[in-house]
Every structure is written in structure tokens, then in C-alpha cells.
């Protein structure tokens, strides 16, 4: 449209803006590392950090892993969105005995009310079935008058779920009498990351709870106990150890009771985008530091961006191939740094410019 030309030229003359012909507007160019929250950003506030698939942007502006609902006893209640985690809940017919942020660490089958009791409140994903005594002549659930008497203590007995895995679900039809349900409030808050083992839902002891035996004097075993692959953080919370299961990572330090596993890039690679106790993006070690916009040592230490050299440049620190072209691995292509986006295990993108050379090298 000819009438757009002056506006378009004015806009193009401003390095901080670009003209989007599709919407015929001048748009604010988000700085490297930030991504627009709308089609045509108008101001810096319209730009935010972008996260990899299966990660979301938390309140602090960090890319955080969405919880995984891959365990057999969990279902996805809410999907992973750009600004909120996936939310998991227990499968139908189960309730959460030990809740964790956006998920459940332990699901149990809903109890069946014993003879003489009737369902007061049906079980939900959060609560177990609540039973109450059946009044004589009110409910056909009373098999005999004895079962329908009020309890002498005046309390309402509740079925206590038997900790069983889904594989032994028949055990849940034998609930214990007179107990109370496991309180969710008493459960420790765990943060479960993708890749943590499926055994999390079926441990031998309650996660985050102290040993049931009284502490032997002088024993060091009275500290809070976390699930396997979880550690006790500074705030006393059971937190998931990071996973080093990605092909480009190796374990540097194992997951301990009070410290996370630490991952680092495998030999021959450097960290382009660091993450807590791990590396979000490993890239092949360049021929030399002069070839990238960021020094390798910087990459290993802080969240930074990887910038390829201008197209056609060749660093002086390594022999140039006979044809004068740089090796394919040294100058990223259209998506060589992001072709892993389809993988659900990879965190945080570099969001930095990558070179697109007409040679494809």
C-alpha cells in the first residue's frame, strides 16, 4: 500500500523497531533473549523470556520445568502453558495422600466404607471417601442392627486407605477401621521435575516424613527423609534432583540427601544456557573463543546467549578448510540450536540470534 510507505520507512529507520507488513504497523523489536507477548509489540513490557516446550515462565521470570503426569496413577488436569505449570491429579478412583506443587506424590485408592457405614462424602482426587454410621431404617447398607449402632466414642469412624500401588488395588477393599485420613497439610511439599522416576508414587516410606521409630539417642537418622531422587533443600523442603538423562549431559555430582545432582555438558560440549545445577543448552565446543559472541568460560557460568559469528567470517585461530568454508558444526543453521525443541526434556532456549548462512554451513 503506497500510503504506508512513509510510515514504513520511518519505522525501518529506527533500529529498535520493525515494520510488520502483515499488520501494517510499526512494532517494537524485543531485545535478544526476550520474546514478544503479542503479534506487534509496542513497548518493552510486551516482551518476555521464552521457555522451551514443557517449561513455563514462573513469577520470578525463570523458565521452570512443568511437572510430569507420566506416572500411572496421575492424569493431567491442566496443560503446561507458557506461564503456568502442568497440573496433575490422581486418576479417577484415587485420592492424593501426599500433595506436591502442581501434582501428587502419593495417590491411594478411595476406601470402601465397611459394613455398617455409608458414604457421607464420595472420594475426590484430593480427598478420600468419608464414611458415617448408617442410621437404622435409613440405609439398606446396614446388614444387621449391630452394624448400625452409633459408635460409643461419639466420633465418626473414617476409612483409612491402605497404602497400595495400583497393581494391588484389591487391597483397598480392606480399609482399616477407626483411623483418620492422611492429612495433606502434614505432607511435605515436593517439587517434581520431568524425568524423576516413576517410583516416586510408590515409596516404602512417606516422603518428607521422619522415620516412624523414635530417634535413638545420638542417632543421626532423625533428619527429614525425602523420596529417592529428591533432596532436602535449605528451606527444609524435599525438592527433585535435576535429571542428567539428556544425551548431552553427564552427572558431575550425584543426588544426595541434602544436595541435588549436578549435571554438566558431556566432553566436547560447552554450556550455552546454564540452569540451576545443570545446563539447559549444550552446544558443540567451538574451534576457538573468537568464533562465538561469548567466551566459553562465560557460557559455563551464567545464563548467556550463544551468538554465531557474522556470516562469512572465519576465525584466525584454526586452520581454514581448503574450500574456505567453516565446518558445519561451528556456525549454527536455521535450527541447529533449536532442533531439540520437540524433545520434552530440554529446558530453556537460548533465544539468541543464530547465523543463517546462504552456504548452509
Amino acid at each position: 500500500f503506497p500510503q504506508d510507505r512513509p510510515f514504513e520507512d520511518t519505522c525501518r529507520g529506527n533500529p529498535g523497531h520493525y515494520y510488520d507488513k502483515a499488520v501494517r504497523r510499526c512494532c517494537y523489536r524485543c531485545p535478544t533473549g526476550l520474546f514478544p507477548t503479542q503479534q506487534c509489540p509496542q513497548r518493552p513490557a510486551d516482551c518476555r523470556k521464552q521457555c522451551e516446550p514443557d517449561y513455563y515462565l514462573d513469577e520470578a521470570g525463570r523458565c521452570t520445568a512443568c511437572v510430569s503426569c507420566s506416572r500411572d496413577d496421575l492424569v493431567e488436569k491442566m496443560p503446561c502453558a507458557w506461564n503456568s505449570s502442568r497440573v496433575c491429579e490422581c486418576q479417577p478412583g484415587m485420592f492424593c495422600a501426599v500433595s506436591v506443587v502442581n501434582s501428587c506424590a502419593r495417590c491411594f485408592f478411595h476406601s470402601v466404607c465397611p459394613a455398617g457405614m455409608i458414604v457421607k462424602f464420595p472420594g475426590t482426587a484430593q480427598k478420600n471417601t468419608v464414611c458415617e454410621p448408617a442410621s437404622p431404617g435409613v440405609s439398606p447398607a446396614c446388614a444387621s442392627p449391630e452394624n448400625c449402632k452409633e459408635p460409643s466414642s461419639g466420633t465418626i469412624p473414617q476409612a483409612k486407605p491402605t497404602p497400595v500401588s495400583p497393581a494391588t488395588s484389591n487391597a483397598s477393599t480392606m480399609p482399616l477401621r477407626g483411623g483418620t485420613r492422611l492429612a495433606q497439610e502434614a505432607a511435605s511439599k515436593l517439587t517434581r521435575a520431568p524425568g524423576s522416576p516413576s517410583s516416586v508414587g510408590r515409596p516404602s516410606s512417606d516422603p518428607g516424613l521422619s522415620p516412624t521409630q523414635p530417634c535413638p539417642q545420638g542417632s543421626g537418622d532423625c533428619r527429614k527423609q525425602c523420596e529417592p531422587d529428591y533432596y532436602l533443600d535449605e528451606a527444609g523442603r524435599c525438592t527433585a534432583c535435576v535429571s542428567c538423562s539428556r544425551d548431552d549431559l553427564v552427572e558431575k555430582t550425584p543426588c544426595a540427601w541434602n544436595s541435588s545432582r549436578i549435571c554438566e555438558c558431556r566432553p566436547g560440549m560447552i554450556c550455552a544456557t546454564s540452569a540451576t545445577n545443570s545446563c539447559a543448552r549444550c552446544v558443540p565446543y567451538p574451534i576457538c573463543a573468537a568464533e562465538t559472541g561469548t567466551k566459553p568460560q562465560d557460557m559455563a557460568e551464567k545464563d548467556t546467549t550463544f551468538e554465531a559469528p557474522p556470516v562469512g567470517t572465519q576465525p584466525d585461530c584454526s586452520p581454514t578448510p581448503e574450500n574456505g568454508e567453516a565446518p558445519a558444526s561451528t556456525s549454527p543453521t536455521l535450527s541447529s540450536l533449536v532442533d531439540s525443541q520437540a524433545s520434552k526434556t530440554l529446558p530453556i532456549p537460548t533465544s539468541a540470534p543464530i547465523a543463517l548462512s546462504s552456504t548452509g554451513k
Epitope: 512494532c27 524485543c30 536455521l334 525443541q341 533465544s351 539468541a352
Partner: nanobody, 123 residues
Framework: QVKLVESGGGSVQAGGSLRLSCAAS????????MGWFRQAPGKEREWVAR????????YYADSVKGRFTISQDNAKNTVYLQMNSLRPEDTAMYDC????????????????WGQGTQVTVSS
């Protein structure tokens, strides 16, 4: 400076096929997208198709779904638009655009544009 160069346009009979290419050079953002727009004389610019180059996710306008296919060749930094079963109403100037994926959406910022390639479909 990002440069987008389109090619592959031309004249074809209705029902025929064409393959447009958009070669990118220079810098472009890593979490990026490339797509095609078209504009027929006297008509509004119309979005045709888009590919998110990192994930390979593709999106199409309803008017071209099932007939057009967008793809990429990372080694050549090129995006293609394979156009089959062409119709006279597909006649337009086809522009390649590139930019960044808008956070939490399936739209592109279209920060960079090529010069366009003409496609003419005769009945």
C-alpha cells in the same frame, strides 16, 4: 542483517503445482518462524502458511489446507511452499516473512520480509 530471497514463482494452469523457496541469510532469532503471505491486486494481504523452525510445527490458512505444504531444509536455511491443485484465486504476489514466535501463541512477529515472487494461475 537478515535477508530473505524468494524464488519459484511463475505461471501455471489451474490444477498445476509450483514450489516456492525462501532462502534466509544473515541473522535470525533462534526460536523463530518463517512463513508465507500473499497479496492479490486490490486485495488485503493474506497469511498463507507458517513453520516454526525449531519444533517443525506447521500452520496453514483454511484456504490452502490440504493443498499447500510448508517445509524446511535446515542445511540450506531455506523454507519451501509446495503448492498443489492450484486455483485461479491463488494468483498473487507471494511474500516470505521471518521473525520470532510470539510467546504462548502460534503467530510470528514477521520482522523480516523478502521482495516477493509472483504466482499466476490461469484457468
Amino acid at each position: 542483517q537478515v535477508k530473505l530471497v524468494e524464488s519459484g514463482g511463475g505461471s501455471v494452469q489451474a490444477g498445476g503445482s509450483l514450489r516456492l523457496s525462501c532462502a534466509a541469510s544473515g541473522y535470525i532469532y533462534s526460536s523463530n518462524c518463517m512463513g508465507w503471505f500473499r497479496q492479490a491486486p486490490g486485495k488485503e494481504r493474506e497469511w498463507v502458511a507458517r513453520i516454526h523452525t525449531g519444533s517443525g510445527s506447521t500452520y496453514y490458512a483454511d484456504s490452502v489446507k490440504g493443498r499447500f505444504t510448508i517445509s524446511q531444509d535446515n542445511a540450506k536455511n531455506t523454507v519451501y511452499l509446495q503448492m498443489n491443485s492450484l486455483r485461479p484465486e491463488d494468483t498473487a504476489m507471494y511474500d516470505c516473512a521471518a521473525g520470532r514466535v510470539v510467546l504462548g501463541a502460534v503467530v510470528c512477529t514477521n520482522e523480516y520480509w523478502g521482495q516477493g515472487t509472483q504466482v499466476t494461475v490461469s484457468s
